[in-house]
């Protein structure tokens, strides 16, 4: 999916009002010095691409993020504010239902969510005007 035509300001507002708080809840008890951000993004569409990938694609050691509250709210925000996003996700959602697993918060998941916070932080940053 190409995130170029999303309403970035509306997504940002949704992130600040709810999604960010759910990510903090997920990370509660984790030291703020524990993880260094290694995943980065260069602009807002790229950030959303990376956010979608880390939030919804299972990775080795962390298969369960898609059912978390922050993930469901992320999906809703993208569906509302990115034209045509919902249609592209129907097949992916059906595939995910088939491989639903028990929720387990592993250290790998905590690290992944820390990376997500970094990507969202980059997404939210003020635009750098050319100097």
């Amino acid at each position: 999916y190409d995130f170029t035509n999303c309403d970035f300001e509306k997504i940002k507002a949704a992130y600040l009002s709810t999604i960010s708080k759910d990510l903090i809840t997920y990370m509660s008890g984790t030291k703020s010095t524990e993880f260094n951000n290694t995943v980065s993004c260069s602009n807002r569409p790229h950030c959303l691409t990376e956010i979608q990938s880390l939030t919804f694609n299972p990775t080795a050691g962390c298969a369960s993020l898609a059912k978390e509250m922050f993930a469901m709210k992320t999906k809703a925000a993208l569906a509302i504010w990115c034209p045509g996003y919902s249609e592209t996700q129907i097949n992916a959602t059906q595939a995910m239902k088939k491989r639903r697993k028990r929720k387990v918060t592993t250290n790998k998941c905590l690290e992944q969510v820390s990376q997500l916070q970094g990507l969202w932080r980059r997404f939210n940053r003020p635009l750098l005007k050319q100097q």
């Epitope: 600040l16 960010s20 939210n124 003020p126």
Partner: antibody
Framework: QVQLVQSGAEVKKPGASVKVSCKAS????????IEWVRQAPGQGLEWMGI????????YYAQKFQGRVTMTADKSTSTAYMELSSLRSEDSAVYFC????????????WGQGTTLTVSS | DIQMTQSPSSLSASVGDRVTITCRAS??????LVWYQQKPGKAPQLLVY???NLADGVPSRFSGSGSGTQFSLTISSLQPEDFATYYC?????????FGTGTKLEIK
């Protein structure tokens, strides 16, 4: 807990340079931008610029272009702001501040460094 | 550059009063606005981000509202510790300019 500790007060002559340090602790230093803000006596807040400690990328307010240099030392988790060709109107309190978790504000600030420029 | 104008520049009020400070941006900044409180000799403290989200530890008597070019910070019932100077800052694009400040004094 998150802390930003700045270097002590400075007295400089016009034309000289000053380098203010901001030592960060309690968080992953390279994950968050640092901004620098100054405040002249009895005046408001003036934004000077930002640095990404991970990449070293900087963005300076146009007013300070050519006179300010922001750097970061990852090994000591310290950010620096150097201002050159000082003039009397640079007399101010200089603050560093850390980007928030969400990237939508600056949530922790240093205690401030007072710079006096006088002949 | 985006200019931020605050009003009033100073305000006298009493403990228990409801006060509102406004901030106007010279162009649309959506909800990208922050409010800070500053006391003499101290660094600013974050109150509100994203125009309406209260920062951690900030009392619920503070609230932010607005979007686009018009914003406000309201203190529903002034407490003695609220007498300070308040600044808005836009967070839309660099440079991240501050408002002119509003000094809140005891009547």
């Amino acid at each position: 807990q998150v802390q930003l500790v700045q270097s002590g007060a400075e007295v400089k002559k016009p034309g000289a340079s000053v380098k203010v340090s901001c030592k960060a602790s309690g968080y992953a230093f390279t994950n968050y931008l640092i901004e620098w803000v100054r405040q002249a006596p009895g005046q408001g807040l003036e934004w000077m610029g930002i640095i990404n400690p991970e990449s070293g990328d900087t963005y300076y307010a146009q007013k300070f272009q050519g006179r300010v240099t922001m750097t970061a030392d990852k090994s000591t988790s310290t950010a620096y702001m150097e201002l050159s060709s000082l003039r009397s109107e640079d007399s101010a309190v200089y603050f560093c501040a850390k980007e928030s978790l969400t990237g939508s504000s600056y949530d922790y600030w240093g205690q401030g460094t007072t710079l006096t420029v006088s002949s | 550059d985006i200019q931020m104008t605050q009003s009033p520049s100073s305000l006298s009020a009493s403990v228990g009063d409801r006060v509102t400070i406004t901030c106007r941006a010279s162009e649309n900044i959506y909800s990208n606005l922050v409010w800070y409180q500053q006391k003499p000799g101290k660094a600013p403290q974050l109150l509100v981000y994203g125009a309406r989200n209260l920062a951690d530890g900030v009392p619920s008597r503070f609230s932010g509202s607005g979007s686009g070019t018009q914003f406000s910070l309201t203190i529903s019932s002034l407490q003695p510790e609220d007498f300070a100077t308040y600044y808005c800052q836009h967070f839309y694009e660099t440079p991240l300019t501050f408002g002119t400040g509003t000094k809140l004094e005891i009547k």
